[in-house]
């Protein structure tokens, strides 16, 4: 899939598909971003699955697991995002991948992303209507660090 | 900043500015756009060392702590793209903060994320020609994470 | 072509767990979501969740979170539904279906195009 | 959770009917609904998405329209293998509902 976009151009304005812009026979999904919402995440924990496995994906063998949870919105670019939950408080114990150690604590790696909402833009009506696409800047939980706990000074 | 695209389109098409699209005061150039870090850049590099600090950003305090890399491409879109380099192979200790410990390994979460390069579109030639966007996926690394070494069946 | 093939029906006491699979073929498996519906005897469709293959991203109803766990090998193109704490309301057909997506980019359209044959669950003392 | 709310619950038809169902949802949807067939002791099977998108391989006769909150699915001719439960189902917001069936029968 090629955007096309004019040297100087302002911003991507009215789509106007050309004959030579043909669609592909199947979408590259815009969606698999990962991002999380704007709202603080609630850190459900899950005792039965608070351990770091020796195998499987990187999130599962984690000393500070996490799980990804679907954020899906029709109207947003990307439509699917994607935000790591922490399945632990606390580091688990690398002797055992079980026991949690009070001395590490998992904690969110938050990063602010860019999205775009379509709305109806200002004046446009009828079924061929175009979309504005807002720019939002969208809170991203990317994974779970185990780090040690911030001291005061 | 608003992106206008038409209800059913393909794909973002060319860029055609129209009279109704007047343009803003300041443009947020899509080339200019810069992604900056999910954690704040420490500029004092204590951080370049294999330790886990009780302070500052959360790559420092990680106990599979990284520093941030620039990756600058002005034909890219984002422009600047941060890449996590683990400081330290294996996990450093939650109790010194600077020993390392063998049963866990520092290993980089990676992502493929869609990035956009700009090309001259095929057949447009003069001082306002327009230019492609072609859709890619970029290995770019978000963090460190301290993990139970894979276990092999 | 397309095919979704289930385990075979399970009789479990109330309390006890069930781990349901579902075997994609004709596909690319990590491309596209897995659905979980359920459907009681003489009953309506009611939704469970769904699961990404690629990065095991879940979305569950609020009524099964904590006791829908699903998961999915990508070695072998299966998914999995497990659900704990069985009672006897949970007696139901259980479908895996394929979300499949649809129209243009960026903004597709999402339907469950190809489903599992269905996996009767009972659950009797 | 968007509640979808179908009727009738059940209707007997002759062959060669038309025959419409609609769907309610408990918000706008924005057009964001699909409708599935199923016949007895078999998985439901897809035919319409996005309210009037016919899926590969479903017969014209089928077709569906609406907006908003308020959808209809339209069977122009009935034909004997149509004797199924219908179900809508919103993809607008997760989690995803079915309206409650309807269940058609010949007459």
């Known amino acids: 899939v090629s955007l096309r976009i004019q040297e100087g151009c302002s911003h991507l304005p009215s789509c106007c598909p050309s004959k030579e812009q043909e669609p592909p026979e199947e979408w590259l999904k815009w969606s698999s971003a990962s991002v999380s919402p704007p709202e603080p995440l609630s850190h459900t924990h899950h005792a039965e699955s608070c351990r770091a496995s020796k195998d499987g994906p990187l999130n599962s063998r984690a000393i500070s697991p996490w799980s990804y949870e679907l954020d899906r919105d029709l109207n947003r670019v990307p439509q699917d995002l994607y935000h790591a939950r922490c399945l632990c408080p606390h580091c688990v114990s690398l002797q055992t991948g079980s026991h949690m150690d009070p001395l590490g604590n998992s904690v969110p790696l938050y990063h602010n992303q860019t999205v775009f909402y379509r709305r109806p833009c200002h004046g446009e009506e009828g079924t061929h209507r175009r979309y504005c696409l807002e720019r939002r800047l969208y809170r991203v939980s990317l994974a779970c660090v185990c780090v040690r706990p911030r001291v005061m000074a | 900043v608003s992106l206008r695209i038409q209800e059913g389109c393909s794909h973002l098409p060319s860029c055609c500015p129209s009279k109704e699209q007047e343009p803003p005061e300041e443009w947020l150039k899509w080339s200019s756009a810069s992604v900056s870090p999910p954690e704040p850049l420490s500029h004092t590099h204590h951080a370049e060392s294999c330790r886990a600090s009780k302070d500052g950003p959360l790559n420092s305090r990680a106990i599979s702590p990284w520093s941030y890399e620039l990756d600058r491409d002005l034909n890219r879109v984002p422009q600047d793209l941060y890449h996590a380099r683990c400081l330290c192979p294996h996990c450093v200790s939650l109790q010194t903060g600077s020993h390392m410990d063998p049963l866990g390994n520092s290993v980089p979460l990676y992502h493929n994320q869609t990035v956009f390069y700009r090309r001259p579109c095929h057949g447009e030639e003069g001082t306002h020609r327009r230019y492609c966007l072609e859709r890619r996926l970029y290995r770019v690394s978000l963090a460190c994470v301290c993990v139970r070494p894979r276990v092999m069946a | 072509q397309v095919q979704l093939v289930q385990s075979g029906a399970e009789v479990k006491k109330p309390g006890a767990s069930v781990k349901v699979s579902c075997k994609a073929s004709g596909y690319s498996f990590t491309g596209y979501t897995m659905n979980w519906v359920r459907q009681a005897p003489g009953q309506g469709l009611e939704w469970m969740g769904l699961?990404?293959?690629?990065?095991?991203?879940?979305s569950y109803k609020q009524k099964f979170q904590g006791r829908v766990t699903m998961t999915v090998d990508k070695s072998i193109s299966t998914a999995y539904m497990e659900l704990s704490r069985l009672r006897s309301d949970d007696t139901a057909v259980y479908y895996c279906?394929?979300?499949?997506?649809?129209?243009?980019?960026?903004?597709?359209?999402?339907?469950?195009?190809?489903w599992g044959q269905g996996t009767l669950v009972t659950v009797s003392s | 959770d968007i509640q979808m709310t179908q009727s009738p619950s059940s209707l007997s038809a002759s062959v060669g009917d038309r025959v419409t169902i609609t769907c309610q949802a408990s918000q706008d949807i924005s057009n964001y609904l699909n409708w599935y067939q199923q016949k007895p002791g078999k998985a439901p099977k897809l035919l319409i998405y996005?309210?009037?998108t016919l899926h590969t391989g479903v017969p014209s006769r089928f077709s569906g329209s609406g907006s908003g909150t308020d959808y209809t699915f339209t069977i122009s001719s009935l034909q004997p293998e149509d004797i199924a439960t219908y179900y809508c189902?919103?993809?607008?917001?997760?989690?995803?509902?079915f309206g409650q069936g309807t269940k058609l029968e010949i007459k």
């Open positions: 996005y309210t009037s």
């Open positions: 189902q919103q993809y607008s917001k997760l989690p995803y509902t």
């Open positions: 699961i990404n293959p690629d990065n095991g991203g879940t």
């Open positions: 279906a394929r979300e499949g997506y649809y129209g243009p980019s960026p903004f597709h359209h999402y339907a469950m195009d190809y």
